[in-house]
């Protein structure tokens, strides 16, 4: 595949990357699919520079990331490093609260209204942020 | 206080149309979620639409979806509801509601509501 | 869509009793229940939110508990005000849906 150089229209483009701002509320699972539709993924925080730039654009509404612990362990959909990257929770977070009997406890990560990370139910509509990066191989095919 | 006080209601033929409005106030109207939900007579109340605090999310009961539309407007305090192609069972008295934040949250403050009939 | 499943549909209860009301969804919804409550003829008042946190102004005998399906409503010693409708509601997802309400009679 080729290459991509600049962003797609009304992306964002942010330190060689591209963000893109929903404006609607969808379940993780359903904002996880639309941004891999894009040839992206929900946006993976690994700066405290990057966390102030979404934060920045989402304003103070609950809005999903690419990080969720329903396979077990906290992990970042594109393989970044949970234990040693940057983090940003709120106190007391995450608490992976099984009260709620959905099986498998809050599974899945957002950002709170002062930006602050939160585990909650995934099911939950919520804002999303798709991100991917200038410079990887796109899934299209070359122009020739 | 916070208060909503819908309007709009009234008598109206099936396949026609009907524009409901909440007045708002007491608040900041353009920082909360709205909602419409609907009671007809004699049952119980039924969830119709919601309206993020900024119009930017909007969705709606399976029963309504293609035929009401919610819509604000901020400057004015007003929350909206217009209905098309009415049917008997739209027949209810029309609560606007509150959300307790920007439209996932709940519903804490409820109007008096107005009151839909359609018939022939 | 989530299914609300309130019971008992209806009650008699006399002053000062203790009355409880219970709400199970057809699917897990966390702890994003409400519960209102409505007397004939006017608009239905929002008693709790998160299944169990009371709104404000709304009196202490009123508690809610429960989580994942299965939520209850207590009212610990009924007073004649208190005689209504009582509805549950999910707002874990939308649609959001109401259970088909507890009418609540004086004995």
């Known amino acids: 595949g080729s290459e991509r150089t600049c962003c797609p229209v009304n992306w964002v483009e942010h330190e060689r990357s591209c963000y893109w701002f929903s404006r609607s509320g969808k379940a993780w699972a359903d904002a996880d699919n639309y941004c891999r539709l894009e040839d992206a993924h929900l946006v993976v925080v690994t700066s405290w520079e990057e966390q102030k730039f979404v934060q920045r654009h989402i304003g103070p509404v609950n809005t999903w990331m690419g990080l969720h612990d329903q396979n077990g362990p906290w992990k970042w959909v594109d393989g970044t490093d949970y234990e040693t990257g940057f983090k940003n929770w709120r106190p007391e977070q995450p608490d992976d609260w099984y009260g709620h009997g959905l099986g498998g406890g809050e599974d899945c990560a957002h950002f709170t209204d002062d930006g602050r990370w939160n585990d909650d139910v995934c099911q939950r509509p919520y804002r999303w942020v798709c991100e991917t990066e200038l410079d990887k191989a796109s899934q299209e095919p070359p122009l020739l | 206080q916070v208060q909503l006080v819908e309007s709009g209601g009234g008598v109206v033929q099936p396949g026609r149309s009907l524009r409901l409005s909440c007045a708002a106030s007491?608040?900041?109207?353009?920082?909360?979620?709205m909602h419409w939900v609907r009671q007809a007579p004699g049952k119980g109340l039924e969830w119709v639409a919601v309206?993020?605090?900024?119009?930017?999310?909007?969705n709606y009961a399976d029963s309504v979806k293609g035929r009401f539309t919610i819509s604000r407007d901020n400057s004015k305090n007003t929350l909206y509801l217009q209905m098309n192609s009415l049917r008997a069972e739209d027949t209810a008295v029309y609560y606007c509601?509150?959300?307790?934040?920007?439209?996932?949250?709940?519903?804490?403050?409820w109007g008096q509501g107005t009151t839909v009939t359609v018939s022939s | 869509d989530i299914q609300m499943t309130q019971s008992p549909s209806s009650l008699s209860a006399s002053v000062g009793d203790r009355v409880t009301i219970t709400c199970r969804t057809s699917?897990?919804?966390?702890?994003?229940l409400a519960w209102f409550q409505q007397k004939p003829g006017k608009a239905p008042k929002s008693l709790l939110y998160?299944?169990?946190s009371l709104q404000s102004g709304v009196p202490s005998k009123f508690s809610g508990s429960g989580s994942g399906t299965d939520f209850t409503l207590t009212i610990s010693s009924l007073q004649p005000e208190d005689f209504a409708t009582y509805y549950c509601?999910?707002?874990?997802?939308?649609?959001?849906?109401f259970g088909g309400g507890t009418k609540v009679e004086i004995k």
């Open positions: 509601a509150r959300d307790q934040g920007v439209g996932y949250d709940g519903l804490d403050v």
């Open positions: 998160k299944a169990s």
């Open positions: 699917q897990g919804i966390g702890n994003y």
């Open positions: 509601q999910q707002y874990m997802t939308y649609p959001l849906t």
């Open positions: 007491g608040f900041t109207f353009s920082t909360y979620g």
């Open positions: 309206i993020w605090y900024d119009g930017s999310n909007k």
